[in-house]
Interface confidence: low
């Protein structure tokens, strides 16, 4: 005679509030004679969930017809699931006895847990911009998920990051959990167009993880390089001086010219161009009148970038005597 096995195939059953949960239980033998009951929990305090013979269980229905003599499927459905329904459910075989039935064998149990999807991850970067080669922290938060097991990964432009710290709260049992992760990212000079991605995988998402992103353009400040040059060609009695401000980000930039320490209001022309890596170049032209200049003209191009301390480059103007002599003949 085959020994009776109580088969509860699912160790864990994730359910959603308001939905119906199906708890499976099959037996391998019709013997010994006696009923199968469902309980939540174990020990003397266990709660009776379903007894075909007696009691009123309005939310419970059976999957099969238990009145059929050869029935071996004792699965049940519980409708309108609430958080109060979580726990481990056992189908238990009783042997007919007198005056009362005797517990014979229990299934291994199915843990019913509320499955709640995590919220879309929100990624926050540092409060202030930082220059390349520095490490900045990004946080990723997702809330409201259950069960507690969750996987979080960080990526920078598709490359997985390893320097991060993750916590899931609370540590104990809860209806829903939150995850918070902090990743440390080293900024590269070309990161204006880079992204960091926080990816959250959870059993409720059925293999389709949620992603939150942050643009490194909001975290990075690429300081400019400056170059001041004098153009060999002159226009009439004027010399053209160029200040090239290269590879800076963000775009916020103030440029001023000064002549021998005196700030000049005039700027002939300027152009702003965007580089492939997202940084900017700014070129400013300044015309210096050399008709009756002394030989010691010093021009300064001063740049204040993104509210930082100003940087400047100086140029001592080279005006030859020959250039001065000829200046009266030039046509403007």
């Amino acid at each position: 005679e085959e020994e009776l096995q109580m088969i509860q195939p699912e160790k864990l059953l994730l359910v959603t509030v308001g939905k119906t949960a199906t708890l499976h239980c099959t037996v391998t033998s019709l013997l010994p004679v006696g009923p199968v009951l469902w309980f939540r929990g174990v020990g003397p305090g266990r709660e009776l969930i379903y007894n075909q013979k007696e009691g009123h269980f309005p939310r419970v229905t059976t999957v099969s017809d238990l009145t059929k003599r050869n029935n071996m499927d004792f699965s049940i459905r519980i409708s309108s699931i609430t958080p109060a329904d979580v726990g481990t459910y056992y189908c238990v075989k009783f042997r007919k006895g007198s005056p009362e039935n005797v517990e014979f064998k229990s299934g291994p149990g199915t843990e019913m847990a509320l499955g709640a999807k995590p919220s879309a991850p929100v990624v926050l970067g540092p409060a202030a911009r930082t220059t390349p080669e520095h490490t900045v922290s990004f946080t990723c938060e997702s809330h409201g998920f259950s069960p507690r097991d969750i996987t979080l990964k960080w990526f920078k432009n598709g490359n997985e990051l390893s320097d991060f710290q993750t916590n899931v709260d609370p540590t104990g049992q809860s209806v829903a959990y939150s995850i918070r992760s902090t990743a440390r990212v080293v900024l590269d000079p070309w990161d204006v167009r880079s992204q960091v991605i926080c990816e959250v995988a959870h059993v409720t998402l059925q293999g389709d993880p949620l992603r939150g992103t942050a643009n490194l353009s909001e975290a990075i400040r690429v300081p400019p390089t400056l170059e001041v040059t004098q153009q060999p060609m002159r226009v009439g009695n004027q010399v053209n001086v160029t200040c090239q401000v290269r590879k800076f980000y963000p775009q916020s930039l103030q440029l001023t010219w000064s002549e021998n320490g005196n700030v000049c209001q005039r700027e002939t022309a300027s152009t702003l161009t965007e580089n492939k890596d997202g940084t900017y170049n700014w070129t400013s032209w300044f015309l210096v009148n050399i008709s009756d200049q002394r030989d010691d003209v010093v021009l300064t191009c001063q740049v204040k970038h993104d509210g930082q301390l100003a940087v400047s480059k100086r140029l001592a103007l080279e005006v030859t005597v020959h250039q001065k002599d000829q200046s009266s003949d030039a046509t403007p």
């Epitope: 922290s137 710290q165 916590n167 709260d169 609370p170 540590t171 104990g172 049992q173 809860s174 440390r184």
Partner: antibody
């Protein structure tokens, strides 16, 4: 006034078990975690684990897994730590402490219970 | 596990001195640092949490600072009642871990 009252000193034989108690007074027991800390001259202070009496949830230091079992009785506002299979390495002062749930420092400490394991 | 290293196990200072006790974590602990004072025969007492937040009733001559992996407890104007062992502890991730302690004595 917040107080954590720990049970008295214990002298136990190797291989035996001991159950230490920590009674919480002056605050809502189920709102805070109870943590347990071991103090020895060799290892200093070591965190054993914590229990949240409200949810029954625990967090453990793997080093003490199988050694320490944490429980809490809400009706008596008392937390317990049972230490099993005792050896001389378990001789120490054990403190129960309180912390706000969700990664906060231990703001109140019991007076400590001295456990001596000796034959 | 995160290791917390207190560079000096003992320290001798004079009354009125300003002294600092350093604590280094083996990885970034994001300001989740507490400092405890333990006097002989007593349980530890929380002085500072969250790197710099002084607990109620703790005198203002105690202060905390630091970030990332490096944290410091400062005592400004050493008093005789400050003789104790001081421990740092991280509560960034479990298992929570303590430094080895720094025993403070008066010269």
């Amino acid at each position: 006034e917040v107080q954590l009252q720990e049970s008295g000193a214990e002298l136990v034989r190797p291989g035996a078990s001991v159950k230490l108690s920590c009674k919480a007074l002056g605050y809502t027991f189920t709102d805070y975690e109870i943590h347990w800390v071991k103090e020895t001259p060799v290892y200093g202070l070591e965190w054993i684990g914590d229990i949240h009496p409200g949810s029954g949830g625990t967090a453990n230091n793997q080093k003490f897994k199988g050694k320490a079992t944490l429980t809490a009785d809400k009706s008596s506002n008392t937390a317990y730590m049972e230490l099993s299979s005792l050896t001389s390495e378990d001789s120490a002062v054990y403190y129960c402490t309180r912390a706000v749930s969700g990664y906060y420092a231990m703001d109140y400490w019991g007076q400590g219970t001295s456990v001596t394991v000796s034959s | 596990d995160i290791q917390m290293t207190q560079s000096s196990s003992s320290f001798s200072g004079s009354l009125g001195d300003r002294l600092t006790i350093n604590c280094k974590a083996s990885e970034d602990i994001y300001d989740r640092v507490a400092w405890y004072q333990q006097k002989p025969g007593n349980a530890p007492r929380l002085l500072i949490s969250g790197t710099a937040s002084l607990e109620t009733g703790v005198l203002s001559r105690f202060s905390g600072s630091g970030s990332g992996k490096d944290y410091t407890l400062s005592i400004n104007g050493l008093q005789a009642e400050d003789v104790a062992t001081y421990y740092c502890q991280q509560y960034w991730t479990t298992p929570w871990t303590f430094g080895g302690g720094t025993k403070l004595e008066i010269k």
